[in-house]
Every structure is written in structure tokens, then in C-alpha cells.
């Protein structure tokens, strides 16, 4: 499977809420011997590999924000911790998963990465990620609502480990 990022750039006014989205593409195993971790973190555009650095989102690590479940089950973070920081990550039955950030500030601007790790009972692991940019703007040039820009390429870096 791969991860698609429907939008590569989100431009939002300060104070607005935004939902960043990734989508799982391709066949997804729903067996009992597989589980999926889906999570979010901030990163930087590395010279070698985007999304290799995993920085917190509003002081919450990718471990704080992770969802895990089998197959296409829906899941979402009910963590009080995440909600106290104005964050919620969610996943549906159709391979979409997202993070919602409330009351955006200029400090929220940056590169965001979604990570999916498919872990099999018998020790193989498939990791894929997607990246998108969030720009939070203030002042007279800021849009009144979030404006999203579609990705030109929806491919993701991925690795299978056995």
C-alpha cells in the first residue's frame, strides 16, 4: 500500500481550525495477524529524506498521537492529553486518517508528516509516510478560511522491513 496526501499545502488564518489528511491507497490486509499504527508529527525537509526527523506537534510526540488498530477499523484519539492541546487524530473505514488542529497560531506553521506502519504478527513491517505544509497567516493578507492546494504527486516514501 501507499499513503497519498490529497493536499500538499494548507494556508490558514490564525485562530482557524484545520484538518490535515492522509489516505491509505492500495490493498490493506484486514487479517488478525496485522495491526496498523497511524500517527502524526512535525518534521523538516531533510536533504536526504523528508519526514525522517520526528518532532512534536504542540508538545505531543508521535507516540502520544498514535492510533493502532487492525485492518480498516475506525479509530480516533480520545486522549484528554491531545484534546487539551487542541488536537485530535482520527481514522475511518476507508483508509482516510487525519489530524485536526484547533485555534491555529503562527507557531503551528511548518511541515507535517503522517506515518503508517503496518506490522505483521510474523515480524515484517511496512512503513509509509506522507508530507504536507501548513502556513498560518495573520494580517490583511491572510485568507478568511483555510485554502488547500492539491498535491501534484501523491507518492510516498515507503519501506518494507522483514
Amino acid at each position: 500500500f501507499k499513503v497519498a496526501t490529497p493536499y500538499s499545502l494548507y494556508v490558514c488564518p490564525e485562530g482557524q481550525n484545520v484538518t490535515l489528511t492522509c489516505r491509505l491507497l492500495g490493498p490493506v490486509d484486514k487479517g488478525h495477524d496485522v495491526t496498523f499504527y497511524k500517527t502524526w508529527y512535525r518534521s523538516s525537509r531533510g536533504e536526504v529524506q523528508t519526514c525522517s526527523e520526528r518532532r512534536p506537534i504542540r508538545n505531543l510526540t508521535f507516540q502520544d498521537l498514535h492510533l493502532h488498530h487492525g485492518g480498516h477499523q475506525a479509530a480516533n484519539t480520545s486522549h484528554d492529553l491531545a484534546q487539551r492541546h487542541g488536537l485530535e487524530s482520527a481514522s475511518d473505514h476507508h483508509g482516510n486518517f487525519s489530524i485536526t488542529m484547533r485555534n491555529l497560531t503562527l507557531l503551528d506553521s511548518g511541515l507535517y508528516c503522517c506515518l503508517v506502519v503496518e506490522i505483521r504478527h510474523h515480524h515484517s513491517e511496512h512503513r509509509v509516510h506522507g508530507a504536507m505544509e501548513l502556513q498560518v497567516q495573520t494580517g490583511k493578507d491572510a485568507p478568511s478560511n483555510c485554502v488547500v492546494y492539491p498535491s501534484s504527486s501523491q507518492d510516498s516514501e515507503n519501506i518494507t522491513a522483514a
Epitope: G46, Q63, H123, A161
Partner: antibody, heavy 120, light 107 residues
Framework: QVQLVQSGAEVKKPGSSVKVSCKAS????????ISWVRQAPGQGLEWMGG????????NYAQKFQGRVTITADESTSTAYMELSSLRSEDTAVYYC?????????????WGQGTLVTVSS | DIQMTQSPSSLSASVGDRVTITCRAS??????LNWYQQKPGKAPKLLIY???SLQSGVPSRFSGSGSGTDFTLTISSLQPEDFATYYC?????????FGQGTKVEIK
């Protein structure tokens, strides 16, 4: 803050077995793989195997296959490593360590180590 | 299995020196390379993950670089507390494998 606390030092006879425990606190236990890594005196680090508690089944290095058993008890957030048919070369410090995610990503938290001495 | 080869196996350096340790993988591991520091009688401590990302709480004098098969750990200005043994480890696939270690000693 995540903490991994291991059981105390052991002295064993050749041919016997040893079981080392690793109790996790301060984080979600079930979701993260725990690996066991050993270090013989003056030597480097050697991965023995690991377990993801939600799966229950373990992943072993070929060298230890058949001689090591790694288990986890979700109710007590404790992982165990049992090594059988001990020989003098198994004298080492045994560490448990937690992966940040999945089977193979980096080991971010380590136990304090358990010295196992095999001697007749 | 993926073999990890570190060099040098030991080095002597003075406080303030720039120190470089290299690690080579027997096959491409993308950026899935981690560096650990170990002091005598203590457990290893994660310094760098994903080849170049600094683990939280680790001083910025430590840096990592590389991709594919060749990787480097650099300590820009060696401090007294940095005298230790350093290990690389691949996190590309199981079985996990470590380099044999590089001992950094006081000159």
C-alpha cells in the same frame, strides 16, 4: 516518563535456565515492541529478539532460536526473557529496551541491565 | 542479516576536539541508522535516530549524516562527559544489528 526496571543479577550453573523480567511504567505497554539485547563482558551489543505485547508472539535472532523464549504479560506491563541450556559464553548483561514504534525502529528507553553469570 | 561495520574501533582525543566515527552497512538501509552512547556499567543511550535526527535532550554538538550504506557520527567539540563507547544500529529490518563499537578515550 517511561521506565523499564529489570530483575536482579543471577548466578546460574551451566545447562540451567534463567528468566529475566522487565517491568514497564509510564507509557502504553501493549503497543510497543520490547527487545532484548545482551552484552558479554568487554564486548558489543547483540540483539536476541523482541515481542509486541498486543501480538504475543516473539521475533528471535537465528542464533538464539530454540534456546530463548520472550513473553509479555499485559496485565502487569512486564516482559520476560528466558534463556535455556546456559553455557559460560552466556555470561553477559541482558538489557530490555523499548522500540519507539513497531518491530525495528530505534530503541528509546532501556532497562538498567541484568547481569547473568554462568559458572560451575 | 545486515552487517554493520564501525571505524575506528577506538580513538584517543582531547577535550574540544572534533571527533568523527563512521559506520558502514552491508546493504542499503536508507536512513534507518541510529547511534547510541554507552558509558561503563550503564545502559546505552539513544543519541541520533534516522541517520541525522537528534534525540530529544541530546546536546547539539552531536550530529549524524549519511544515507544508503555510509554514515557518520560527529561530535563537534568533545566534552569530558563524551568519553564513552558509541554504537551504530540499523533499524531497517530484523534481526537488528549493531556495529562493534568505537571507544573514545582521553588522549
Amino acid at each position: 516518563q517511561v521506565q523499564l526496571v529489570q530483575s536482579g543479577a543471577e548466578v546460574k550453573k551451566p545447562g540451567s535456565s534463567v528468566k529475566v523480567s522487565c517491568k514497564a511504567s509510564g507509557g502504553t505497554f501493549s503497543s510497543y515492541a520490547i527487545s532484548w539485547v545482551r552484552q558479554a563482558p568487554g564486548q558489543g551489543l547483540e540483539w536476541m529478539g523482541g515481542i509486541i505485547p498486543i501480538f504475543g508472539t516473539a521475533n528471535y535472532a537465528q542464533k538464539f532460536q530454540g534456546r530463548v523464549t520472550i513473553t509479555a504479560d499485559e496485565s502487569t506491563s512486564t516482559a520476560y526473557m528466558e534463556l535455556s541450556s546456559l553455557r559460560s559464553e552466556d555470561t553477559a548483561v541482558y538489557y530490555c529496551a523499548r522500540h519507539v514504534l513497531g518491530w525495528v525502529l530505534e530503541l528509546d528507553y532501556w532497562g538498567q541491565g541484568t547481569l547473568v553469570t554462568v559458572s560451575s | 542479516d545486515i552487517q554493520m561495520t564501525q571505524s575506528p574501533s577506538s580513538l584517543s582525543a582531547s577535550v574540544g576536539d572534533r571527533v568523527t566515527i563512521t559506520c558502514r552497512a552491508s546493504q542499503s538501509i536508507s536512513s534507518y541508522l541510529n547511534w547510541y552512547q554507552q558509558k561503563p556499567g550503564k545502559a546505552p543511550k539513544l543519541l541520533i535516530y534516522a541517520a541525522s535526527s537528534l534525540q530529544s535532550g541530546v546536546p547539539s554538538r552531536f550530529s549524524g549524516s549519511g544515507s544508503g550504506t555510509d554514515f557518520t557520527l560527529t561530535i563537534s567539540s568533545l566534552q569530558p562527559e563524551d568519553f564513552a563507547t558509541y554504537y551504530c544500529q540499523q533499524s531497517y529490518s530484523t534481526p537488528l544489528t549493531f556495529g562493534q563499537g568505537t571507544k573514545v578515550e582521553i588522549k
